[in-house]
């Protein structure tokens, strides 16, 4: 039961995390204009991975995509790549983990297969989370570096080639969303890996030998009795999940909405 809960929780946490990574990647507020020295501007700038926006006090907002690849800073391209890799790995991980969930029966899939799939998805979630955290951190570092540069010829942001000295950018909401989402995906991945250990079947089937103290007339016969191992006559080493009441094979299986055959 604990294994199923851990696996399910890991899946849900990862799902939320990956949704957050996707949201962060799509958000325009990766960097926002720093208003500390200039709170009286009627024009507010903010930038994302894909476009930069200007919001005027009138409420009018204008966004422009970065329609060039070669003209963009290499670091921005790296951040984009990290976030996309994180999303792709996370999405594949989610797909794999759905079929690995203990609460879903797919034909006669062995526990060992589910354990392997759980571990695979867990590793994918961990790498996905790390990619997101790395991407956001690289971008944040780039912002900090640019913030303290006061030379007029530096890049102010991801899309701009022209710098006006008074415009400085600071951390946008997307960075915090990305960090939290990456962390959640990472935690979800770790939980999946932990669940995998509980799912993995014990490989060794211990066959105990019963030794009887016998009289002179009784000859010793090895293997005469099978020792009670707790699994009765079931030679397949199945784990008992619901408090030892029944084995999984003893539970009648009815078709349900979770059956994918």
């Amino acid at each position: 039961m604990a294994v199923t809960a851990c696996q399910g929780l890991g899946f849900v946490v990862s799902l939320i995390g990956i949704a957050g990574i996707i949201a962060a990647t799509c958000m325009d507020q990766w960097s926002t204009q720093d208003l500390y020295n200039n709170p009286v501007t009627a024009v507010f700038n903010y930038q994302g991975l894909w476009r930069s926006c200007v919001r005027e006090s009138s409420g009018f907002t204008e966004c422009r995509g970065y329609f060039t690849l070669l003209g963009l800073p290499a670091m921005l391209q790296a951040v984009r790549a990290l976030m996309i890799v994180g999303i792709v790995l996370g999405a594949i991980g989610l797909l794999v983990s759905i079929f690995a969930l203990k609460c879903i029966r797919i034909g006669s899939m062995e526990d060992s297969a589910k354990a392997n799939m759980t571990l695979t998805s867990g590793i994918m979630f961990i790498v996905s989370g790390l990619c997101a955290i790395a991407g956001v951190s690289v971008f944040a570092n780039m912002l900090v570096t640019n913030f303290w540069m006061s030379t007029a010829n530096m890049y102010t942001g991801m899309g701009g080639m022209v710098q006006t000295v008074q415009t400085r950018y600071t951390f946008g909401a997307a960075l915090f969303v990305g960090w939290v989402a990456g962390g959640l995906t990472l935690i979800g991945g770790v939980m999946m890996c932990i669940a995998c250990r509980g799912l993995a079947p014990e490989e060794t089937n211990y066959k105990a030998v019963s030794y009887h103290a016998s009289g002179h007339s009784v000859a010793y016969k090895p293997g005469g009795f099978k020792a009670s191992t707790g699994f009765g006559s079931n030679t397949k080493n199945k784990k008992i999940y619901d408090g030892g009441a029944r084995t999984e094979d003893e539970v009648q299986s009815y078709p349900s909405k979770h059956d994918y055959v």
């Epitope: 009627a42 930069s52 926006c53 200007v54 204008e62 006006t164 000295v165």
Partner: antibody, heavy 118, light 113 residues
Amino acid sequence: QVQLVESGGGVVQPGRSLRLSCAASGFTLTSYGVYWVRQAPGKGLEWVAVVWAGGNTNYADSVKGRFTISKDNSKSTLYLQMNSLRAEDTAVYYCARDRGRLLAMDYWGQGTLVTVSS
Amino acid sequence: DIVMTQSPDSLAVSLGERATINCKSSQSLLNSGNQKNYLAWYQQKPGQPPKLLIYGASTRESGVPDRFTGSGSGTDFTLTISSLQAEDVAVYYCQNDHFFPFTFGQGTKVEIK
């Protein structure tokens, strides 16, 4: 068509209060920002205050704390509550609409004269 | 506050001649985010409210004759009347639309020589 009509001007003693109104038609105050701009006799234009479509406001330093800009969206009316009036507040007060993009005043009222004198 | 300084204070030009008014701001009105200059030009004739001529430093308001041209970027801007007409006699103001308060220049009076 867009129209702005100011009212409420007159002669007032220093230290007293006055409320100006600006009736807007041809557009909604929920979609556009509206400004108050004043012009002292024989002088240039001075920006006074603005209320944006969303309700945010900004003021010139010279009137901050004394003047309050507000609007009634349902009545399509803009207000300028002027307290602690001074002689230097004597001017023609215009209300003007913001054009929405690149922040310029595209429509102006005819103005209302406020005279602060003892 | 941003200080807007216009030059000259007054200008006398013959009909059909070019009139040029300059405006200098104490801080750049160019926004790096969209590469737009937040500066407007207004015309005010005696006894009338101001009229918007140019916004965004160079975009002509609809209905404004094409003899009026706005140019410049950053801190230096120019309003040019390519061929002065009798109806162009007025006071012209530039205005900062980027930073609060939205300050105006002191005005330039254009007359016919």
